[in-house]
């Protein structure tokens, strides 16, 4: 951009050289050369001259006019025309910007991940801006009244040392920028309720080798919350439909479950979890792939028709991924197929 | 830390003007995103005008028009130039350091008295 330049004049915008995109805009040129009685004044735009919506104002003053200018930035710069220099001589420039005011950020979201010390909270900023844009996130205590404020780019990282005062808080996200100012909606948080466990991860498979083969699942957590509630999905490399189990979970010791999958297949499985009766979950765990080893005996395979796991399984439901290349995306696809015993299976958050 | 000290708050007539300075000391200043905020009794703190970035200021819509922030680097100091000041416009004033992801730290703030 032209930040540094000698100006031999003034150029200036109006109304102003950040504004809202769509708007129409004068930019002027006023020259304040020393032996020079310009001929022309010329306007340029990102290096390029312009030919059009040009008025001379006076002996030293032009207008370029723009009706609706819609590009995110310019670099604008003015020259003179003078009787007897075989160059143009440089009058003035400026960076011009156009943007929109922020949308109100939405789906306000704080979480603390166990162990890590922070509340991280995150909010969707909605349309792009095209202007520098701050976004300033309120903390306050409903028990002492007493409010924080950060300063943020697109999350926040909060110390739960600076939370020490209460466990009640009201949060919300306030997106300022040259053109305007809006607020998030308020976030009713207690420290206890947004606590996600820490990270779950499947750490082997193995499949027997019975006449009817069944693989095992081995997975993990280093939580200390004692009442765990986990998801684990399982497909084949080769299908776009997952199946998902439900598990009641303790990690003081090793998670094992037992499914019975289709013989000399390539499974990806993953799991999360999170506090029972509590809404945030773990993002799901890196995907654990694992071969099923090949058929030994001539039977008619029916893989829903075995018990699925000696563990309290609750359900097990089919989703179907939106894309392959979205396979974080789930969304429903048929009712519980298998249920073990009563349960409340919950599936909105798939994915 | 970032030490900040207001000062230029007072009394003036309705259509009158004021200038606040704030002086900052401490080794983040320049990471700064300065703001002007202020606090009438019984009402939240609220958002005067902020320094977005080079050549980019936010001005709350109430103040628009009014009032001009500015800056003079060499001295560590930002101004709040307010003119056709208002009744309305009565509160305590702070000027406030934000730096990204750390928690804002304010002034002890100068108080405005706008009569009618």
């Known amino acids: 951009g032209i930040t540094s330049i000698n100006c031999s004049g003034d150029m200036w915008v109006e109304p102003g050289e950040i504004f809202q995109m769509g708007m129409n805009v004068s930019i002027y040129c006023q020259e304040a050369l020393k032996h020079c009685r310009p001929r022309n004044l010329y306007f340029y735009k990102n290096g390029f001259k312009e030919e059009f919506d040009i008025t001379r104002i006076n002996r030293t003053t032009a207008r370029i006019w723009y009706k609706g200018f819609s590009e995110p930035h310019a670099y604008m710069h003015c020259t003179a025309e003078c009787p007897g220099h075989f160059q143009e001589t440089l009058i003035c420039g400026k960076d011009i910007s156009s943007g929109h005011p922020p949308d109100a950020p939405s789906n306000l979201t704080c979480v603390i991940y166990e162990y890590s010390g922070n509340m991280t909270c995150t909010w969707n900023t909605g349309k792009p801006t095209y202007i520098d844009t701050k976004y300033i996130v309120h903390v306050k205590s409903l028990e002492t009244e007493e409010e924080q404020q950060y300063l943020a780019s697109s999350y926040v990282k909060i110390s739960t040392d600076s939370l020490q005062g209460s466990r009640k808080y009201l949060v919300w996200v306030q997106a300022v920028n040259s053109l305007g100012m809006e607020n998030s909606q308020q976030l009713h948080v207690h420290l206890d309720d947004i606590v996600i466990p820490s990270a779950s991860i499947i750490s082997r498979a193995e499949t027997t080798n019975d006449t009817v083969p069944k693989t095992i699942v081995y997975w993990k957590s280093k939580t200390m919350i004692e009442k765990v509630f986990c998801e684990m999905r399982y497909k084949t490399t080769t299908n776009q439909t997952w199946s998902v189990k439900e598990f009641d979970a303790n990690f003081t010791y090793v998670q094992q479950s037992e499914f019975y999958l289709e013989p000399d297949s390539k499974y990806v499985f993953q799991v999360r979890c999170q506090e029972t009766g509590k809404r945030n979950w773990q993002p799901w765990s890196s995907p654990f792939v694992h071969q099923t080893s090949q058929e030994t005996g001539k039977r008619n395979w029916q893989p829903w028709s075995s018990p699925f796991v000696h563990q309290t399984s609750q359900t097990v439901s089919q989703v179907t991924a939106k894309s392959s290349h979205e396979p974080q995306k789930m969304e429903m696809l048929s009712a519980t197929i298998f249920r073990g015993h009563p349960a409340s299976g919950n599936h909105q958050d798939i994915g | 830390q970032v030490q900040l000290q207001e000062s230029g708050g007072g009394s003036v007539q309705a259509g009158g003007s004021l200038r606040l300075s704030c002086a900052a000391s401490?080794?983040?200043?320049?990471?700064?995103?300065m703001g002007w905020y202020r606090q009438a009794p019984g009402k939240e703190r609220e958002l005067v005008s902020m320094?977005?970035?080079?050549?980019?200021?936010f001005y709350a819509d109430s103040v628009k028009g009014r009032f001009t922030f500015s800056q003079e680097n060499a001295k560590n100091t930002v101004y709040l130039q307010m003119n056709s000041l208002k009744p309305e416009d009565t509160a305590m004033y702070f000027c406030?350091?934000?730096?990204?992801?750390?928690?804002?730290?304010w002034g002890q703030g100068t108080q405005v008295t706008v009569s009618s």
């Open positions: 320094l977005i970035s080079d050549g980019s200021t």
């Open positions: 401490g080794y983040t200043y320049s990471s700064c995103t």
């Open positions: 406030g350091c934000a730096t990204l992801g750390s928690r804002t730290v």
